[in-house]
């Protein structure tokens, strides 16, 4: 439906508070280095302009597109060239090229200082002094560090952030109340950001068809009682929402997401029996709840898939008439019967089915050719099952930290050219699959594990894309979205890698390690482990374990010493020498 003024339309639909928050998120995600105050000023100017358009949709410039209005506003930033370099060239372009240019300059790993959490009293004072500024600053800091964060979901996080401060700043023990809540929000936020990053990568790198296939599979698992036509409608609407958010159209995205939640709740009876509680919540909670809702029960007595997709005489006719619809029906029918499969496995099965039909429907005897297609699925199903079984056994044997270390070694040997911080971050996250998924029963392990690994490997892919250093990473990341994990799993030690020169400075530690949190200390040790493997890729597990055990003992000893710094200096030299000898460096 055409509106005379798009900006007035969105302002009225979303309300002033959400409008301002979403514009702030949009601007912070585009200009990630700009100071908070500059963004607030721009947002206020856009908001005042929007209000004039609400009052009179025919007023000057009110008919302009949101991209034009927002892009013009961003291009008024005085320091654009100095701060962003070539991104300033975007401003010489016309829409829609200008917006595409801004999107291409989003930085997944911006050079921003780590967010340090102030003392609880300091935070509570800031919250009480100016609640609005405090919450805006939260949106700004998250959005600039996570330029693809799902904007309507960030509004939900901000609402929870506000609730945590409102409750805990009045509590007797503010810290005990607030800190666990902030930790939970931080961890959930990182997970939410990574999940959304995969959706955007799917759309931007592999296209709408790939995203729709993912959505058909996931929604069919979640809503197995819904008809195919209903699932198809939800997929179309969901694709529009995510295309908009990934494209920087945050106002449209939030508006359409609200409409989708409304539609789902109005049509619960034909979608899922699990939506009742979600649909009683306010908008932001409702949308979040729907996105996380558990799978509905499978309908009883679903017929065999073979009847429609192998035995029917109409298989090739139906496929030829509407390929994507027929494959969509296959994916829907398979997914609703298999909540125990990962989405990526379901997509691999659908791809195998498609490849078989492409070959067989052009053959002399199509039916004879595709009759055994379901037999081809067996190894595809068994591969992730076996991998998960093996890795869960290893996790249970080692615990999370040592399991992460095993993965660090494994992945450093596969792709040693990747930067150490990236290898540490990605391997630590890969290792979290153990505590996240291995506790589940068999029927829930694969969807938990493999779909989580897809999210984590996408982090590796987007970080590597910024500064590509490994052809093997590029190949696994770009060839097939659904085969990324098997591609990385299949990589062996990179025999072409020339070991890194030994640098004693890399293995020099100081007393500051003693004051670090357990997590930070682990990261220091894991960084050293990656560097060790880069120096000695052929080192055995036993050699590496011995060196790491010595290292842990060294840190523990020096942190207990009276003169910590001297201990680190003297014992450190001994440790380096002993490690070099042990590894034959």
């Amino acid at each position: 439906d055409a509106h005379k003024s798009e900006v007035a339309h969105r302002f009225k639909d979303l309300g002033e508070e959400n409008f301002k928050a979403l514009v702030l998120i949009a601007f912070a995600q585009y200009l990630q280095q700009c100071p908070f105050e500059d963004h607030v000023k721009l947002v206020n100017e856009v908001t005042e302009f929007a209000k004039t358009c609400v009052a009179d949709e025919s007023a000057e410039n009110c008919d302009k597109s949101l991209h034009t209005l927002f892009g013009d506003k961003l291009c008024t930033v005085a320091t654009l060239r100095e701060t962003y370099g070539e991104m300033a060239d975007c401003c010489a372009k016309q829409e829609p090229e200008r917006n595409e240019c801004f999107l291409q300059h989003k930085d997944d790993n911006p050079n921003l200082p780590r967010l340090v959490r102030p003392e609880v009293d300091v935070m509570c004072t800031a919250f009480h002094d100016n609640e609005e500024t405090f919450l805006k600053k939260y949106l700004y800091e998250i959005a600039r560090r996570h330029p693809y964060f799902y904007a309507p979901e960030l509004l939900f996080f901000a609402k929870r952030y506000k609730a945590a401060f409102t409750e805990c700043c009045q509590a007797a023990d503010k810290a005990a109340c607030l800190l666990p809540k902030l930790d939970e929000l931080r961890d959930e936020g990182k997970a939410s950001s990574a999940k959304q990053r995969l959706k955007c990568a799917s759309l931007q790198k592999f296209g709408e068809r790939a995203f729709k296939a993912w959505a058909v599979a996931r929604l069919s698992q979640r809503f197995p009682k819904a008809e195919f036509a209903e699932v198809s409608k939800l997929v179309t609407d969901l694709t529009k929402v995510h295309t908009e958010c990934c494209h920087g159209d945050l106002l449209e995205c939030a508006d359409d997401r609200a409409d989708l939640a409304k539609y789902i709740c109005e049509n619960q009876d034909s979608i899922s029996s699990k939506l009742k509680e979600c649909c009683e919540k306010p908008l932001l909670e409702k949308s979040h709840c729907i996105a996380e809702v558990e799978n509905d029960e499978m309908p009883a007595d679903l017929p065999s898939l073979a009847a429609d997709f192998v035995e029917s005489k109409d298989v090739c006719k139906n496929y030829a008439e509407a390929k994507d619809v027929f494959l969509g029906m296959f994916l829907y029918e398979y997914a609703r019967r298999h909540p125990d499969y990962s989405v990526v496995l379901l997509l691999r099965l659908a791809k195998t089915y498609e490849t078989t039909l492409e070959k067989c429907c052009a053959a002399a005897d199509p039916h004879e050719c595709y009759a055994k297609v379901f037999d081809e699925f067996k190894p595809l199903v068994e591969e992730p099952q076996n991998l998960i079984k093996q890795n869960c056994e290893l996790f249970e044997q080692l615990g999370e930290y040592k399991f992460q270390n095993a993965l660090l070694v494994r992945y450093t040997k596969k792709v040693p050219q990747v930067s150490t911080p990236t290898l540490v971050e990605v391997s630590r996250n890969l290792g979290k699959v153990g505590s996240k998924c291995c506790k589940h029963p068999e029927a829930k392990r694969m969807p938990c594990a493999e779909d989580y690994l897809s999210v984590v490997l996408n982090q590796l892919c987007v970080l590597h894309e910024k500064t590509p250093v490994s052809d093997r990473v590029t190949k696994c990341c770009t060839e097939s979205l659904v085969n990324r994990r098997p591609c990385f799993s299949a990589l062996e030690v990179d025999e072409t890698y020339v070991p890194k020169e030994f640098n004693a400075e890399t293995f020099t530690f100081h007393a500051d390690i003693c004051t670090l949190s357990e997590k930070e200390r682990q990261i220091k040790k894991q960084t050293a482990l990656v560097e060790l493997v880069k120096h000695k890729p052929k080192a055995t597990k036993e050699q590496l374990k011995a060196v790491m055990d010595d290292f842990a003992a060294f840190v523990e000893k020096c942190c207990k010493a009276d003169d910590k710094e001297t201990c680190f200096a003297e014992e450190g030299k001994k440790l380096v020498a002993a490690s070099q000898a042990a590894l034959g460096l």
Epitope: D314, K317, A320, E321, K323, V325
Partner: nanobody, 123 residues
Framework: QVQLLESGGGKVQPGGSLRLSCAAS????????MVWVRQAPGKGLEWVST????????VYAESVKGRFTISRDNAKNTVYLQMNSLRAEDTAVYYC????????????????RGQGTLVTVEP
């Protein structure tokens, strides 16, 4: 909007040949499967033949197999039906059709269809 325009029908003797054409517009022809269906006087729609988007897959009803050939030219947005060894029972209005989003595959009443071209086979 989707438009399908059939041509090439006419009156022919048993054993004769005709070539039907269907010019398509208003949709992405090169990514759409195309279908010929027919309706004999006083009967329902009957599927005749299907061709995939890239022309690699062609499927025929048993009643026309070996006599009819479906083909397409994606550069011209046109689909063809070459009909040889025509029989009296082939007499019908022939429609060119393509899948309409939201319809059931094979439910030809719901597909986009042209106005049809009449083929009459009689001595």
């Amino acid at each position: 909007q989707v438009q399908l325009l059939e041509s090439g029908g006419g009156k022919v003797q048993p054993g004769g040949s005709l070539r039907l054409s269907c010019a398509a517009s208003g949709f992405t022809f090169s990514t759409s499967g195309m279908v010929w269906v027919r309706q004999a006087p006083g009967k329902g729609l009957e599927w005749v033949s299907t061709i995939s988007d890239d022309a690699r897959i062609t499927v025929y009803a048993e009643s026309v197999k070996g006599r009819f050939t479906i083909s397409r030219d994606n550069a011209k947005n046109t689909v063809y039906l070459q009909m040889n060894s025509l029989r009296a029972e082939d007499t019908a209005v022939y429609y060119c059709a393509t899948y309409r989003a939201g319809s059931r595959i094979g439910s030809y009443e719901d597909y986009y269809r042209g106005q049809g071209t009449l083929v009459t086979v009689e001595p």
